[in-house]
């Protein structure tokens, strides 16, 4: 007699997770009389897959009707694949004894498992960061295999260089994670800025799955100050304005101080949004010069996201105003945009508020 | 391990029916072909008809086909070969047995089910 | 139908001699390669039990002093050397069509 040949046609079959698997094994001949059983893996810890002769396996059909005459073929389905089910099954078949006994195997087929990454995450910096610092942005996706995938960084669609990938993990495995670092430098224009992080593999059939964060929950943009005083009215008050610009977010406190006296404190709410995504604002102090003796010494300070204040100040010189004159004063305007105070001399006399 | 227990031993007249039930035990009942064969006393063995459980397709010795009728029941695992219109000489050991190869041959039997058709 | 004739209907032999048991089909028996006969051992009291599958295999737990061959229409089982134990009845089944047995052989010790 011919020996007996259990043939498993494909060395390697690919199915998407959810569909089915069909793995083939045909016998050449109807002898012996004895069970096929599939198992997944080789050796003492092989996991048995299908017994056609006993043993209950839901999601495992015999391809053809085992109850047919002279039937050799021994092809099984394996319903609703996931990435747990790859690995290399064995047709093995047995001589019918008590009990079965292993006669021969057939030379495995290799399943493996196409499984979509799930859709990327990005998570940013846990605190914003001020402009023209560098900030790093991450991105995860999980469970998908084959372990080739490509991962890219944009910048408002510009690809981003200063980039760290990992693959994990590095050996063989049902699934696979990738985990991406993208060092992003802000800018002041970066407010509606977004980054994406975009995944491409084999299951996606060249369209790609996108993660996003906006850079607006990154970043922190810190205002510009300008102090200036306007005319001299005919009352004797002069308007001082403290205009604060191009800041992000929206939390700020200002407070005037009067020779370093708080006079007011204000907080800002419902500002209207610059085209750049930052804010404005402006506060006003009108100081009745007449009022005072000495020169004054007003402070705009103000206190942007928590960060330390910054200040400018404004000196006005009570002499340059005669008392019965309501004439312009020629303001010395000077001074830095920095934190702590700066002097900026100009003249007024005693002061009176008035807030918007 | 593989077993057909079959139901005990019966006494009918003639003219009336029996049911001989068979319970299979240590395979995939529905896996394989069950044969039903008969032995009248000293004689040898006739084949009667055989049925797949997974779908109760059967095949009918043409001597049986009016008379006999094969049914399974697969939440009992359990196969029935009932007999109608009882005659003397149908007195016989009435076997069961599991069709292990697709070959239509029998594997494994029962320990058989002697019924007897007495007036 | 095809029809199985079995010869002899009853066999003595010596023990430790050979006994040959023949079936011969009204038509052949073979297909795509196979013989369809089995050949049955049945002791008083007890069912039948297979012996050989497919005219020359013989199955799991039985003796190798048991053969068979043969092929379209005459089919032999043979016993090399009879054993007390050996005394049954045989009976050869076809499966070409629908199964069909042999009268049957009773061997007995002379």
């Known amino acids: 007699e011919e020996e007996l040949q259990v043939i498993q046609p494909e060395k390697s079959v690919s199915v998407a997770a959810g569909d089915s698997a069909t793995l083939n094994c045909t016998v050449s001949s109807l002898i012996p009389v004895g069970p096929i059983q599939w198992f997944r893996g080789a050796g003492p810890g092989r996991e048995l897959i299908y017994n056609l002769k006993e043993g209950h396996f839901p999601r495992v059909t015999a391809v053809s009707d085992p109850t047919k005459r002279n039937n050799m073929d021994f092809s099984i389905r394996i319903s609703n694949i996931t990435p747990a089910d790859a690995g290399t099954y064995y047709c093995v078949k047995f001589r019918k004894g008590s009990p079965d006994v292993e006669l021969k195997s057939g030379a495995g087929t290799e399943l493996s498992v196409r499984a979509k990454p799930s859709a990327p995450v990005v998570s940013g910096p846990a605190v914003r960061a001020t402009a023209e610092h560098t900030v790093s942005f991450t991105c995860e996706s999980h469970g998908f295999s084959p372990r080739d995938i490509t991962l890219k960084w944009f910048k408002n669609g510009n690809e981003l260089s200063d980039v760290q990938t990992n693959v994990d993990p590095a050996g063989k495995s049902v699934s696979y994670s990738i985990r991406s670092t993208a060092r992003v430098l802000l800018t002041r224009r970066d407010v509606h800025s977004q980054v994406i992080c975009e995944v491409a593999h084999v299951t996606l059939q060249g369209d790609p799955l996108r993660g996003t964060a906006n850079l607006s929950e990154a970043i922190r943009v810190p205002p510009f100050l300008e102090v200036t005083q306007q005319s001299m009215r005919a009352d004797n008050q002069v308007n001082v304005t403290c205009q604060v610009t191009k800041f992000y977010p929206q939390r700020l406190q200002l407070t005037w101080l009067e020779n370093g006296n708080v006079s007011r404190t204000e907080m800002a709410s419902a500002l209207p949004e610059n085209k750049d995504g930052t804010y404005n604002w402006t506060s006003w102090l009108l100081v009745n010069v007449s009022a005072h003796r000495d020169d004054v010494k007003l402070t705009c300070q103000v206190e942007h996201d928590g960060q330390p204040a910054v200040n400018k100040s404004f000196s006005v010189k009570v002499s340059a105003h005669p008392k019965e004159q309501g004439s312009n004063t020629a303001a010395e305007n000077t001074g830095t945009n920095e934190r702590g105070s700066s002097d900026y001399k100009d003249d007024d006399d005693k002061h009176h508020h008035h807030h918007h | 391990q593989v077993q057909l227990v079959q139901s005990g031993a019966e006494v009918k007249k003639p003219g009336a029916s029996v049911k001989v039930s068979c319970k299979a035990s240590?395979?995939?009942?529905?896996?394989?072909?069950i044969n039903w064969v008969r032995q009248a006393p000293g004689q040898g063995l006739e084949w009667i008809a055989m049925?797949?459980?997974?779908?109760?397709?059967?095949h009918y010795n043409q001597i049986f086909k009016d008379r006999a009728t094969l049914t399974t029941d697969t939440s009992t695992s359990t196969a029935y070969m009932e007999l109608r219109s009882l005659r003397s000489d149908d007195t016989a050991v009435y076997y069961c047995?599991?069709?292990?190869?697709?070959?239509?041959?029998?594997?494994?039997w029962g320990r058989g089910t002697l019924v007897t058709v007495s007036s | 139908d095809i029809v199985l004739t079995q010869s002899p209907d009853s066999l003595a032999v010596s023990l430790g001699e050979r006994a040959t048991i023949n079936c011969r089909a009204s038509?052949?028996?073979?297909?795509?390669?196979?013989?369809?006969i089995f050949w049955y051992q049945q002791k008083p009291g007890q069912p039948p039990k297979l012996l050989i599958y497919?005219?020359?295999n013989l199955d799991s737990g039985v003796p190798d002093r048991f053969s068979g061959s043969g092929s379209g229409t005459d089919f032999t089982l043979t016993i090399s050397s009879l054993q007390a134990e050996d005394v049954a009845v045989y009976y050869c089944?076809?499966?070409?069509?629908?199964?069909?047995f042999g009268q049957g052989t009773k061997l007995e010790i002379k």
């Open positions: 047995a599991m069709d292990y190869g697709s070959l239509y041959a029998m594997d494994y």
């Open positions: 240590g395979y995939t009942f529905t896996n394989y072909w």
């Open positions: 049925i797949d459980p997974s779908d109760s397709e059967t």
């Open positions: 038509k052949s028996v073979s297909s795509s390669g196979y013989n369809y």
């Open positions: 497919l005219a020359s």
């Open positions: 089944q076809h499966s070409r069509d629908l199964p069909t």
